[in-house]
């Protein structure tokens, strides 16, 4: 494995192979597994791709899918930071319209306090 450490796909890896890339990451990085057909290769990332958040675990940090409804990017399992087009962000969740007492800020698609 060590012979592949200079390979760009092995950046940030603790364990790496030519065929599958990283399988374990350095402490502060997040593991992400790219699947292509029936093959896969791991990467160690400083931040997770859109649609995933950084999940910290005892053995290894990993990127995990954002499962908040209508959310594009999230900070954690239950806190959205960017909603899908057509939805408004309010307190970490996505709504098709802002709750009472909040108005949509069109440029950021966020709900802010104030009159409609």
């Amino acid at each position: 494995r060590a012979s592949y450490v200079s390979n760009p796909i092995c950046k940030g890896c603790l364990s790496c192979s030519k065929d599958n890339g990283c399988s374990r990451c350095q402490q502060k990085l997040f593991f992400f597994l790219r699947r292509e057909g029936m093959r896969q290769y791991g990467e160690c990332l400083h931040s997770c791709p859109s649609g995933y958040y950084g999940h910290r675990a005892p053995d290894m940090n990993r990127c995990a899918r954002c499962r908040i409804e209508n959310c594009d990017s999230c900070f954690s399992k239950d806190f959205c930071t960017k909603c899908k087009v057509g939805f408004y962000l309010h307190r970490g969740r996505c709504f098709d319209e802002c709750p009472d007492g909040f108005a949509p800020l069109e440029e950021t698609m966020e709900c802010v306090e104030g009159c409609e």
Partner: antibody
Framework: EVQLVESGGGLVKPGGSLRLSCAAS????????MSWVRQAPGKGLEWVSS???????YYPDSVKGRFTISRDNAKNSLYLQMNSLRAEDTAVYYC???????????????????WGQGTTVTVSS | DIQMTQSPSSLSASVGDRVTITCKAS??????VAWYQQKPGKAPKLLIY???TRHTGVPSRFSGSGSGTDFTLTISSVQAEDFATYYC?????????FGQGTKVEIK
């Protein structure tokens, strides 16, 4: 509450066919990958097939070309069409949520997080 | 295909004992290992995924650890309802493969 209920098992002769069904409820069926796993009498678990939420299908070599997995999102149902059955296909067949080989989730859906009670398939002459 | 080898194949324990089951993968599977519990005549239940993450509703006495090729499921203080067969599974690359199972019996 997530519920998976299999049906369609039975006794079939070698070379015969059978179609298993799995009725899903308690979750947004169309959003999840689904899998079939079998267990021969007194043996361990063996993965049989998976289908992604988008309809991509995956099989191990042992059933490739003989079994076909499919889904009907409108009916919240998963199916397994089994052709050219052999004695070694005798098992309890479980429907399970998750296990998509085509997508990385980094969470519970990479494993198989909920299972049905199983349906028994016996292949014998 | 990746082989998953569990040990022991069976063990006897008393209520309150600490139980450890190991699973060895034939090649590096990162942390992509799940553990399931199965009782006779019942469907398997997911306990742990990604080596150490407990599934919803799983008691804290169940814990998983490991990465690469060596993985462990630990029951810190086994209860009467924990006597069952346990399977590991790698969810790193297809075909998904399971260990042969470890039966935990009452001493």
């Amino acid at each position: 509450e997530v519920q998976l209920v299999e049906s369609g098992g039975g006794l079939v002769k070698p070379g015969g066919s059978l179609r298993l069904s799995c009725a899903a409820s308690g979750f947004t069926f169309s959003s999840y990958a689904m899998s079939w796993v079998r267990q021969a009498p007194g043996k361990g678990l063996e993965w049989v097939s998976s289908i992604s939420s988008g309809g991509s299908t995956y099989y191990p070599d042992s059933v490739k070309g003989r079994f076909t997995i499919s889904r009907d999102n409108a009916k919240n149902s998963l199916y397994l069409q089994m052709n050219s059955l052999r004695a070694e296909d005798t098992a309890v067949y479980y429907c399970a949520r998750g296990g998509d080989p085509g997508v990385y989730n980094g969470d519970y859906e990479d494993a198989m997080d909920y299972w049905g009670q199983g349906t028994t398939v016996t292949v014998s002459s | 295909d990746i082989q998953m080898t569990q040990s022991p194949s069976s063990l006897s324990a008393s209520v309150g004992d600490r139980v450890t089951i190991t699973c060895k993968a034939s090649q590096d599977v990162s942390s992509a290992v799940a553990w399931y519990q199965q009782k006779p005549g019942k469907a398997p239940k997911l306990l742990i995924y990604w080596a150490s993450t407990r599934h919803t509703g799983v008691p804290s006495r169940f814990s998983g650890s490991g990465s690469g090729t060596d993985f462990t499921l630990t029951i810190s203080s086994v209860q009467a309802e924990d006597f069952a067969t346990y399977y590991c599974q790698q969810h790193y690359s297809t075909p998904w493969t399971f260990g042969q199972g470890t039966k935990v019996e009452i001493k």
